[in-house]
């Protein structure tokens, strides 16, 4: 039994890091493998993660972590019974994938303005809380070409757009994702999408 693709890990910079790897053949990850991880910190203890299958030869492990700070470093040991298959380390602050924003809501009752709001996925005491920026994706269910991205580079989790920038009388969907420039993170997953029917009053034409 050998590791084909070494474990790569990403952290949500809160409490969970996810590590994925591939074996050289079909593997029952949960019965055959264990990922031991330990914070490099005086007197800390090792923890065991039981991996799950992620495709035939792929494995994934969700590591529970103490509140993450930038200096944290973990040792990782991948075991198959008594055989050490791979040894490595992981610094969560250097491999951050933020949590996805939640509670995306479209408010359509503000004159002819659409107000989209969502929730920051971090508590106020987390470092990323004040460092997230967002991308909002809006698309038409009727017209695949009607697809747009709005970059929200301010901290407030909201976006205002004129309803008239979208077509009237049809349904749209929106979703939002986050990233943090300070840690050069990857983008989060997209939030669940929300749907609304776009309608607004066309201005009267003057002749």
């Amino acid at each position: 039994m050998k590791v084909l693709q070494e474990p790569t890990c990403v952290s949500d910079y809160m409490s969970i890091s996810t590590c994925e790897w591939k074996m050289n053949g079909p593997t029952n990850c949960s019965t055959e493998l264990r990922l031991l991880y330990q914070l490099v910190f005086l007197l800390s203890e090792a923890h065991t993660c039981i991996p799950e299958n992620n495709g035939g030869a792929g494995c994934v492990c969700h590591l529970l972590m103490d509140d993450v700070v930038s200096a944290d470093n973990y040792t990782l040991d991948l075991w198959a019974g008594q055989q050490l298959l791979w040894k490595g380390s992981f610094k969560p602050s250097e491999h951050v994938k933020p949590r996805a924003p939640g509670n995306l809501t479209v408010h359509t009752n503000v004159s002819d303005t659409l107000l989209l709001t969502w929730s920051n996925p971090y508590p106020p005491d987390n470092y990323l809380y004040n460092h997230l920026t967002y991308a909002v994706n809006i698309w038409s269910e009727n017209d695949p070409a009607d697809f747009r991205i709005y970059n929200v580079t301010y901290l407030e989790p909201s976006l205002r757009i004129a309803a008239s920038t979208l077509k009237s009388g049809i349904s749209y969907r929106a979703r939002v994702r986050a990233w943090a420039q300070c840690y050069n993170t990857t983008w989060s997953e997209w939030s669940p999408s929300t749907k609304w029917h776009n309608s607004y009053r066309e201005p009267f034409e003057q002749h």
């Epitope: 914070l39 490099v40 910190f41 005086l42 800390s44 103490d66 509140d67 700070v69 200096a71 470093n73 005491d125």
Partner: nanobody, 119 residues
Amino acid sequence: EVQLVESGGGLVQPGGSLRLSCAASGSTSYRYCMAWFRQAPGKGLEAVASIRPRSGRAYYADSVKGRFTISRDNSKNTLYLQMNSLRAEDTAVYYCAASDNDGNCQDYWGKGTLVTVSS
């Protein structure tokens, strides 16, 4: 210059309690790792307890688990060690130690405070 100054040591009877304090001062108030070590007469240095910077999660040597409690007050830049159910084998010089960027807690040291457990 980082300075760590311990206080609170003394003579206590077996089964008694003491609370050690360590006041930190210097270039930055933030310390990634803070810990207590001890050295008993004629013995080597032993790590007693360590504490995380934000969560306050604590780690202990098996010999003191359930009896000692480490805590830190970041606003006062002070580290504490509450020692209960003291035993003769806890007699030692107790040192406060810290580090800024790694988990060894051994970049900065105090001068130590003597704890004697004897009847």
